[in-house]
């Protein structure tokens, strides 16, 4: 099976060839394809924790407008996971977006 | 049609440091990674990097890690690359390279013109 | 890193002659390869990734095989537009590395 940080190269062999996640994407592993990081910011979150090859960003909701002093705050807001919004490739075995000429005339 | 543009030919001091742009146009700019490669003269091709303007995500060749930042900015569909302690052997043309967008693979489908870098005193 | 070692480094040849150029990775690649074409003064045209699979217009004259370690990509009728310095590329690991090129010359 693809590890951590790589995807399969053939959705029909999966794990035979595996190849590393593009910039900006992370897998698990496991044979999952690559996904964009979530970008917190973007997202109007924190980063929590940096995404790396083979996990996404962990964000947390930015914190409320400060109305009372810092010492009476509650507890920092709970981190949560943001789903990226758009899966790379955008389907491991649907149509390719680039046309593919196969020697021999197969499709 | 799709189409990367480049800068013109920088001459620069060792020490300095340059910086290198790649107009995209004809595509979505922040749906494919953008990476940059450089061809000294009359020698082969070196990878530097690569970064993904969605969410600017990077990934760099080590032997460059330290020395080149790559950037984009996503209103002006536009990839920076930035060189710095610049030496003579980092003479050479510097092309931004488009991804393939057709699945996993890991090759450029789409070239800019190269922009000529010389470094001399 | 993956060292890709292309033969020859240059060779003549005359238009409709078959033309071989072999790439030999330092470590198993799978069908993780790509082939591009360049010309004096101008930037790298893909032709063939995962080993085989053309690129789109490029014609069919052009054919990649191979998987591994050992790659070729062959010119069946080679064409006055072909003469060409031809350079195969690795993407099964980072750093993407290329071979040191192939000069097709007119004999």
């Known amino acids: 099976r693809c590890r951590a940080g790589t995807q399969p190269l053939d959705s029909y062999k999966p794990g035979v060839d595996c190849a590393p996640c593009p910039p900006g994407h992370f897998s698990p592993g496991d044979n999952q394809a690559c996904k964009p990081w979530t970008n917190c910011t973007l997202a109007g979150k924190h980063t929590l924790q940096p995404a790396s090859n083979s996990s996404d960003a962990i964000c947390e909701d930015r914190d409320p407008p400060a109305t009372q002093p810092q010492e009476t705050q509650g507890p920092p807001a709970r981190p949560i996971t943001v789903q990226p919004t758009e899966a790379w490739p955008r389907t491991s075995q649907g149509p390719s977006t680039r046309p593919v000429e196969v020697p021999g005339g197969r499709a | 049609q799709v189409q990367l543009v480049q800068s013109g030919a920088e001459v620069k001091k060792p020490g300095s440091s340059v910086k290198v742009s790649c107009k995209a146009s004809g595509y979505t700019f922040k749906d494919y990674t953008m990476h940059w490669v450089r061809q000294a003269p009359g020698q082969g091709l070196e990878w530097i990097g690569g970064?993904?303007?969605?969410?600017?995500?990077?990934t760099y060749n080590q032997n460059f890690k330290d020395r080149a930042t790559l950037t984009v900015d996503k209103s002006t569909s536009t990839a920076y690359m930035e060189l710095s302690s610049l030496r003579s052997e980092d003479t050479a043309v510097y092309y931004c390279?488009?991804?393939?967008?057709?699945?996993?693979?890991?090759?450029?489908?789409?070239w800019g013109q190269g922009t000529t870098v010389t470094v001399s005193s | 890193d993956i060292q890709m070692t292309q033969s020859p480094s240059s060779l003549s040849a005359s238009v409709g002659d078959r033309v071989t150029i072999t790439c030999k990775a330092s470590?198993?690649?799978?069908?993780?390869v790509a082939w591009y074409q360049q010309k004096p003064g101008k930037a790298p045209k893909l032709l063939i990734y995962?080993?085989?699979t053309r690129h789109t217009g490029v014609p069919s004259r052009f054919s990649g095989s191979g998987s591994g370690t050992d790659f070729t990509l062959t010119i069946s009728s080679l064409q006055p537009e072909d003469f060409a310095t031809y350079y195969c590329q690795q993407y099964i690991n980072y750093p993407l590395t290329f071979g040191g090129g192939t000069k097709v010359e007119i004999k």
């Open positions: 995962w080993a085989s």
């Open positions: 970064i993904y303007p969605n969410n600017g995500g990077s």
């Open positions: 390279a488009r991804m393939g967008y057709h699945g996993p693979h890991l090759d450029f489908d789409v």
């Open positions: 470590q198993d690649v799978g069908a993780a």
